[in-house]
């Protein structure tokens, strides 16, 4: 007897993180074997959709042509072959911005930091939210979230981060969004560009530079938990 | 469990050489600044040095600076600490944590012990 | 260098009861003030970071407070486990420096 069929993969483009209005795709690559591809949606009827497999039916497609809430939400995919169905895929997380207006993104006490020394990043918003995000552009793990403490909602969150060392440069945005969906964001703040200058260290070359220049907890102010597969969203609570 | 331990103490002369160790579970060690913070006999808590996550920063506190080398070897999930010219004030316990990126250090080892003497 | 002072070395207190211990820098440290415990045999444990947040699995009846220079560490309903020496530590500016730490006894 086989073992059980090896899980498919699930993917979404442009990305996994979409703007209220812009289409997306969701794609689902199995074996060659396939003969059909399920789409199922959390916290919905099984299946949310069906797909016949492209040629050479190692994938399918599955289209959304305009992000709306209903979208927004946390898939698997499935497929078919004539021995069965698959194991279900690694979670993909669907996120929708554009929910809710734009906070703003402040750097104090000062966007351009010594290195060596700290800044804490603050992000307003004009209603009171209970999670708050903060991305960095050309990250490796792009949103990174900080729940409001004492569980109470708040206009604001602070993202402290120290040392400072020249990783911490570059561009950050950040993101307001309700508890009840973490996968409904608000419109994303004006950008804010860190810049780090000077420094006390001890610069040396190195052959094994960080990929993950603002992914990683040292820096990114936030507790890890973990990462979700395939969806660039990796979680980060207080 | 996040786990961060220290080997390589031991009783070395003054002027001699010593390189500590810290070998890290439990997390993803290349994703996280490392210090050195060491302990004199009945006294305080002393930072000694700090690498970043990419090993392309370093720091040192001045009463190591030019004596003291820290490095890392992220393939290996291991933390050194090079120590030369060595001085009695240089004992002490010598503590590995791990950096939370937000000025903290979040996760300490139990400590080596470095004795210099003659 | 920032200077962290605890003037207190020394604090004696009963099972139950609230003690609170205090730490100065000698600049503004903007919030990035930080509380460890360090038992009898050297266990060193982070327990309040950036002033006032509690790091995980540490007891609710620590907490921490205080803004610019002054800073205080607060244990209510202190318990056996909790007769220790706690330091306060600055991250605000690199060099990282520690208050020289106050000594919980048992009265």
């Known amino acids: 007897q086989a073992g059980p069929l090896p899980k498919p993969t699930l993917w979404a483009e442009p990305g996994s993180v979409i703007s209220w209005g812009n289409s997306v795709t969701i794609w689902c690559q199995g074996t060659l074997e396939a003969r059909e591809y399920r789409l199922d949606k959390e916290e919905s009827p099984a299946p949310w959709d069906r797909q016949n497999p492209l040629e050479p039916k190692n994938k399918a497609r599955f289209s959304i042509p305009s992000m709306t809430e209903d979208y927004a939400g946390r898939y698997r995919c499935y497929y078919r072959s004539p021995v069965g169905w698959s194991q279900p895929s690694d979670p993909l997380e669907l996120v929708m911005t554009g929910a809710y207006s734009k906070p703003t993104l402040s750097a104090l006490p000062s966007p351009l930091v010594t290195s060596g020394k700290s800044v804490t990043l603050l992000c307003q918003s004009r209603s009171p939210m209970d999670t708050f995000l903060l991305i960095k552009e050309r990250a490796a793990h792009p949103l990174l979230h900080l729940r409001s403490e004492h569980g109470a909602q708040q206009h604001q969150a602070e993202f402290p981060m120290s040392p400072v060392t020249s990783v911490h440069g570059g561009t950050y945005r950040c993101f307001s969004s309700h508890g009840f969906s973490h996968y409904l964001l608000s419109h994303p703040s004006d950008p804010l560009e860190l810049i780090v200058s000077g420094s006390l260290e001890d610069p040396r070359p190195s052959p094994t530079r960080s990929v993950s220049t603002a992914a990683g907890p040292e820096d990114q102010p936030l507790m890890p938990t973990g990462s979700v597969p395939h969806s660039g969203l990796r979680r980060h609570w207080e | 469990e996040v786990q961060v331990v220290e080997s390589g103490g031991g009783l070395v002369k003054p002027g001699g050489s010593l390189k500590l160790s810290c070998a890290a579970s439990?997390?993803?060690?290349?994703?996280?600044?490392m210090h050195w913070v060491r302990q004199a006999p009945e006294k305080g808590l002393e930072w000694v040095a700090y690498i970043s996550t990419g090993i392309i920063t370093v720091y040192y506190a001045d009463t190591v600076k030019g004596r003291f080398t820290m490095s890392r070897d992220n393939a290996k999930n291991t933390l050194f600490l090079q120590m030369t010219s060595l001085r009695s004030e240089d004992t002490a316990i010598y503590y590995c944590?791990?950096?939370?990126?937000?000025?903290?250090?979040?996760?300490w080892g139990q400590g080596t012990s470095v004795i210099v003497s003659s | 260098d920032i200077q962290m002072t605890q003037t207190t070395s020394s604090l004696s207190a009963s099972l139950g009861d609230r003690v609170t211990i205090s730490c100065r820098a000698s600049q503004d440290i903007s919030n990035f003030l930080n509380w460890y415990q360090q038992k009898p045999d050297g266990t060193v444990t982070l327990l309040i970071y950036?002033?006032?947040r509690l790091h995980s699995g540490v007891p609710s009846r620590f907490s921490g407070s205080g803004s610019g220079t002054d800073y205080s560490l607060t244990i209510s309903n202190l318990e056996q486990e909790d007769f220790a020496t706690y330091f306060c530590q600055q991250g605000n500016t690199l060099p990282w420096t520690f208050g020289g730490g106050t000594k919980l006894e048992i009265k």
């Open positions: 950036y002033t006032s």
């Open positions: 439990g997390f993803t060690f290349s994703d996280y600044g």
């Open positions: 944590a791990r950096a939370d990126g937000r000025g903290a250090m979040d996760y």
